[in-house]
Interface confidence: low
C-alpha cells in the first residue's frame, strides 16, 4: 500500500482519532515525515504524531485488558457463584446438625438441657469457624464437647443427688472422662469423621476462593510497554496510513497475543492441575469425607455415646466415686 | 436464607424428619461444578487464540494488516513482516511472568499440593482405624437411605442426605451467562472496523 501523497489531508484519521481522544491538535493537518515515531515507523509521510502514538498505546493496552476480562467473565461468574452457594450451604448444614442434636437432647435427655444446648452450640460455632479457616483444632473441639457433657450427664443422670455446678468435681469428672474412656471409642470416632470431613470441606472452599483470586489476578494484569507497542502496531498503526478499514492478519494476531500473554500462559499447567486435583478431591467427598453426611449423622453418634455411658453406669459411678472422692468430700464438708 | 424453609425439618414432639422430595444434594452440585470447571481446563492456553477471535481480525477480507503494510491474507508476509525490526518477541517471552503472576502460580502450586494430600485414595474410603473401631452405627449401605442414628428409640432416618430445595438463591445454570465456554476454538462474528 503506497503512503499517502504529501498534499493529501489527514481528515479521515482526524475523525477516527477524535473517537479516541478529544484533542485534534495532536493530529497533523497533512501527512508529515513522522521521524519522531517509535512504534508506527513510517515508510513515507504519515498522519500520526508521537502524542497520537502514545494515546494508541494506552488504548491498545486498555482494549487488551477489557478483552481479557470479557474472556474470563463466565469462568469468574461460575466460581464466585459456587463459592457463595457452598459457603452458605455448609453453614446451613451446620445449623441443621446443631438443631438435630439439640432436638435429640430435648426429646431423649430433657434433664441435660439447657446446658447441653450451650455445649452443642459452642461446638457447632467452632465447626463453622473451622470451615471458614479459623485456626482451631478439631480434636480439641470434640474433646471439649465431651468434657463439658460428661459432668452434666454424671450429675444429672448417673448421680442426681450431687449438688449442681460443683467446680471441683466438674474438673475431676472432665479428667475422668478421658482417663476412663467413659464414652468408649465414640469420641475418637467422631474426631476422625469430623476432622476428615471438615478438612476436606475447608480445603474445598479455600480452593474455590483461590480460583477467584487467580481469575482476578489475570483479569487485572497490566500489560508491558513492549506488549502495548506490539498491540498498537497491530490495531492502530494502519490508521497512520489512513487505512481505517483493514484488520490485522490472523497469524500475526496470534503471534502478538502469544508474546503479550507469555506470562499468563505459564499459569496454564498449574490451572489444569488445579481443576484435576479439585475433581479428585470432590470425587472422594463422600461418607466420612462428606461433612453433610457426617454432621447430620452426628446427633445419632452422640446419642449412641450417651447410651454407652448409661449402659456402663453402675461400674462408672463406683469408679468415679473413688476417683473423685477427694473433690466430693471437700464439697460436703 | 432462600435455600431452605426457615422452619426446621423436625417435628420436635416425635423427632421425625420431614422427607423433602429429592431436589439436589450438595455432592451432585459439587460434581456439576467440576464438570463446568473442566470445560475451562484449557482456559489459559487458549487465551491468545480466544482474544484474536474476539477482536477485529481479517477472516473473509482479501487484504490484511501485518503491522507494517497491507498484504494478501495468505501471503508469507501476513504473519512475518509486522514483527521485523521492532522488538524481539523472544525477548518478551524470556522476561518471564510478572511478579503477581509468579505469586499466583506459587499459590496454585500450594493449593494443588494440599488438594492432592487431602484427596481420598481410590478404593480407600474408610480408614483402617475406623474399620477396626466399627462404623456400623452411622454408616449405612450405599443403596439404602442414608441412616441418621441407629434403630434406637427416637432415632430417625433422613432420606438421602440434606436436600437443596427448589428455592435456591441463585440460578446457577451458567449456560445463559455472559461469555462462551470453550474459548479455544470459538470464532465470533468479527468486528469489522468501520465508520458508523
Amino acid at each position: 500500500q503506497p503512503p499517502p501523497p504529501p498534499d493529501a489531508t489527514c481528515h479521515q484519521v482526524r475523525s477516527f482519532f477524535q473517537r479516541l481522544q478529544p484533542g485534534l491538535k495532536w493530529v497533523p493537518e497533512t501527512p508529515v515525515p513522522g521521524s519522531d515515531l517509535q512504534v508506527c515507523l513510517p515508510k513515507g509521510p504519515t498522519c500520526c504524531s508521537r502524542k497520537m502514538e502514545e494515546k494508541y498505546q494506552l488504548t491498545a493496552r486498555l482494549n487488551m485488558e477489557q478483552l481479557l476480562q470479557s474472556a474470563s467473565m463466565e469462568l469468574k461468574f461460575l466460581i464466585i457463584q459456587n463459592a457463595a452457594v457452598f459457603q452458605e450451604a455448609f453453614e446451613i448444614v451446620v445449623r441443621h446438625a446443631k438443631n438435630y442434636t439439640n432436638a435429640m437432647f430435648k426429646n431423649n435427655y430433657p434433664s441435660l438441657t439447657p446446658q447441653a444446648f450451650e455445649f452443642v452450640g459452642e461446638f457447632f460455632t467452632d465447626v463453622s469457624l473451622y470451615i471458614l479457616g479459623s485456626d482451631i483444632n478439631v480434636d480439641d473441639m470434640v474433646n471439649e464437647l465431651f468434657d463439658s457433657l460428661f459432668p452434666v450427664i454424671y450429675t444429672q443422670m448417673m448421680n442426681p443427688g450431687l449438688p449442681e455446678s460443683v467446680l471441683d468435681i466438674n474438673e475431676c469428672l472432665r479428667g475422668a472422662r478421658r482417663d476412663l474412656k467413659v464414652f468408649g471409642s465414640f469420641p475418637k470416632l467422631i474426631m476422625t469423621q469430623v476432622s476428615k470431613s471438615l478438612q476436606v470441606t475447608r480445603i474445598f472452599l479455600q480452593a474455590l476462593n483461590l480460583g477467584i483470586e487467580v481469575i482476578n489476578t489475570t483479569d487485572h494484569l497490566k500489560f508491558s510497554k513492549d506488549c502495548g507497542r506490539m498491540l498498537t502496531r497491530m490495531w492502530y498503526c494502519s490508521y497512520c496510513q489512513g487505512l481505517m478499514m483493514v484488520k490485522p492478519c490472523g497469524g500475526y494476531c496470534n503471534v502478538v497475543m502469544q508474546g503479550c500473554m507469555a506470562g499468563v500462559v505459564e499459569i496454564d499447567k498449574y490451572w489444569r492441575e488445579y481443576i484435576l486435583s479439585l475433581e479428585e478431591l470432590v470425587n472422594g467427598m463422600y461418607r466420612i469425607y462428606d461433612m453433610e453426611n457426617v454432621l447430620l449423622g452426628l446427633f445419632s453418634t452422640i446419642h449412641d455415646s450417651i447410651q454407652y455411658v448409661q449402659k456402663n453406669g453402675g461400674k462408672l459411678t463406683t469408679t468415679i466415686g473413688k476417683l473423685c472422692a477427694h473433690s466430693q468430700q471437700r464439697q460436703y464438708r | 436464607s432462600a435455600y431452605y424453609p426457615e422452619d426446621l425439618f423436625i417435628d420436635k414432639k416425635i423427632l421425625k424428619v420431614a422427607h423433602v422430595e429429592h431436589e439436589e444434594t450438595l455432592s451432585s452440585r459439587r460434581r456439576e461444578l467440576i464438570q463446568k470447571l473442566k470445560s475451562f481446563i484449557n482456559f489459559y492456553s487458549a487465551l491468545p487464540g480466544y482474544i484474536c477471535s474476539h477482536s477485529p481480525v481479517a477472516e473473509n477480507d482479501t487484504l490484511c494488516w501485518n503491522g507494517q503494510e497491507l498484504v494478501e491474507r495468505y501471503s508469507q508476509k501476513a504473519a512475518r513482516n509486522g514483527m521485523k525490526n521492532q522488538f524481539n518477541l523472544h525477548e518478551l517471552k524470556m522476561k518471564g511472568p510478572e511478579p503477581v503472576v509468579s505469586q499466583i502460580i506459587d499459590k496454585l502450586k500450594h493449593i494443588n499440593q494440599l488438594l492432592r494430600t487431602m484427596s481420598v485414595p481410590k478404593g480407600k474410603v474408610l480408614d483402617k482405624s475406623l474399620d477396626e473401631e466399627g462404623l456400623e452405627s452411622g454408616d449405612c449401605g450405599d443403596d439404602e437411605d442414608e441412616c441418621i442414628g441407629s434403630s434406637g428409640d427416637g432415632m430417625v432416618k433422613v432420606k438421602n442426605q440434606l436436600r437443596f430445595l427448589a428455592e435456591l438463591a441463585y440460578d446457577l445454570d451458567v449456560d445463559d451467562a455472559p461469555g462462551n465456554k470453550q474459548h479455544g476454538n470459538q470464532k465470533d462474528n468479527e468486528i469489522t472496523t468501520s465508520h458508523s
Epitope: 501523497p5 501527512p31 | 468486528i191 468501520s194 465508520h195
Partner: antibody
C-alpha cells in the same frame, strides 16, 4: 455475537421528548463509536449524530443540532439518543449502529 | 454536505439473472489513502440495514461473493452476479468520507 438491542416503540405528543436506548454486547463497548440514524416512512436513511463510546465525545448533524443529545453509560454498555421538541415529521424508525452492526430499530 | 443519487429507483429481476445498481456522488469520495469511502447496505423487508460492501469494493464478512462493488470517479456500482430470492430488499449507498454521513435514496 455482536448485538445492539434497542428499547421498545414510543408514542409521544408534539413538543415532548423521547429517549431511546441501545444496549451493546459481544464486543468491547468503549472501543467503537455509535451512530444514530433514522428512517422516516418513505424517506431515505438520515444520519443524526455519533458518540465516542470511550470518552463520550459527540458529533451531531447540523439538521438536529440543539434538538438531539447522544449519551452513553459505559458500565451498562448502553448508548442513548434523546430527541426534544418533537414534531409530527419526527415519526420514524430510529437505529443505532456501531462498526457495521445495526440495532433492530425503535419506532 | 455530500449528496448521493441512486438509480434506478426500482429494479425488477428474475432469480439467476445479474443486477446492477448505480450511486453517483456530488463530490469525490476518494481518500488520500487510495480508498473510496462509500459503503453499500441492504435493508431486507422488516429488518435493519446490513453491510454488504465497504470502502467501495471490499466485501464485508459473511457476504456472498456474488456481490461486488466498483468505482469510477464519482460513480459507484453494486453488482449481483446471479440474483437469488433472498436478495429482495432496498439497497442503499452511504458515504463515510465526511460528516454528516449521507445515504442514497435507495433502490428497491
Amino acid at each position: 455475537q455482536v448485538q445492539l438491542v434497542q428499547s421498545g416503540a414510543e408514542v409521544k405528543k408534539p413538543g415532548a421528548s423521547v429517549k431511546v436506548s441501545c444496549k451493546a454486547s459481544g464486543y468491547t463497548f468503549t472501543s467503537y463509536g455509535i451512530s444514530w440514524v433514522r428512517q422516516a416512512p418513505g424517506q431515505r436513511l438520515e444520519w443524526m449524530g455519533w458518540i465516542n463510546a470511550g470518552n463520550g465525545n459527540t458529533k451531531y448533524s447540523q439538521k438536529f443540532q440543539g434538538r438531539v443529545t447522544i449519551t452513553r453509560d459505559t458500565s451498562a454498555s448502553t448508548a442513548y439518543m434523546e430527541l426534544s421538541s418533537l414534531r409530527s415529521e419526527d415519526t420514524a424508525v430510529y437505529y443505532c449502529a456501531t462498526v457495521v452492526y445495526w440495532g433492530q430499530g425503535t419506532l | 454536505e455530500i449528496v448521493l443519487t441512486q438509480s434506478p429507483l426500482s429494479l425488477p429481476v428474475t432469480p439467476g439473472e445479474p443486477a446492477s445498481i448505480s450511486c453517483r456522488s456530488s463530490q469525490s469520495l476518494l481518500h488520500s489513502n487510495g480508498y473510496n469511502y462509500l459503503d453499500w447496505y441492504l435493508q431486507k423487508p422488516g429488518q435493519s440495514p446490513q453491510i454488504l460492501i465497504y470502502l467501495g469494493s471490499h466485501r464485508a464478512s459473511g457476504v456472498p461473493d456474488r456481490f461486488s462493488g466498483s468505482a469510477s470517479g464519482t460513480d459507484f456500482t453494486l453488482k449481483i452476479s446471479r440474483v437469488e430470492a433472498e436478495d429482495v430488499g432496498v439497497y442503499y449507498c452511504m458515504q463515510a468520507l465526511q460528516t454528516p454521513l449521507t445515504f442514497g435514496g435507495g433502490t428497491k
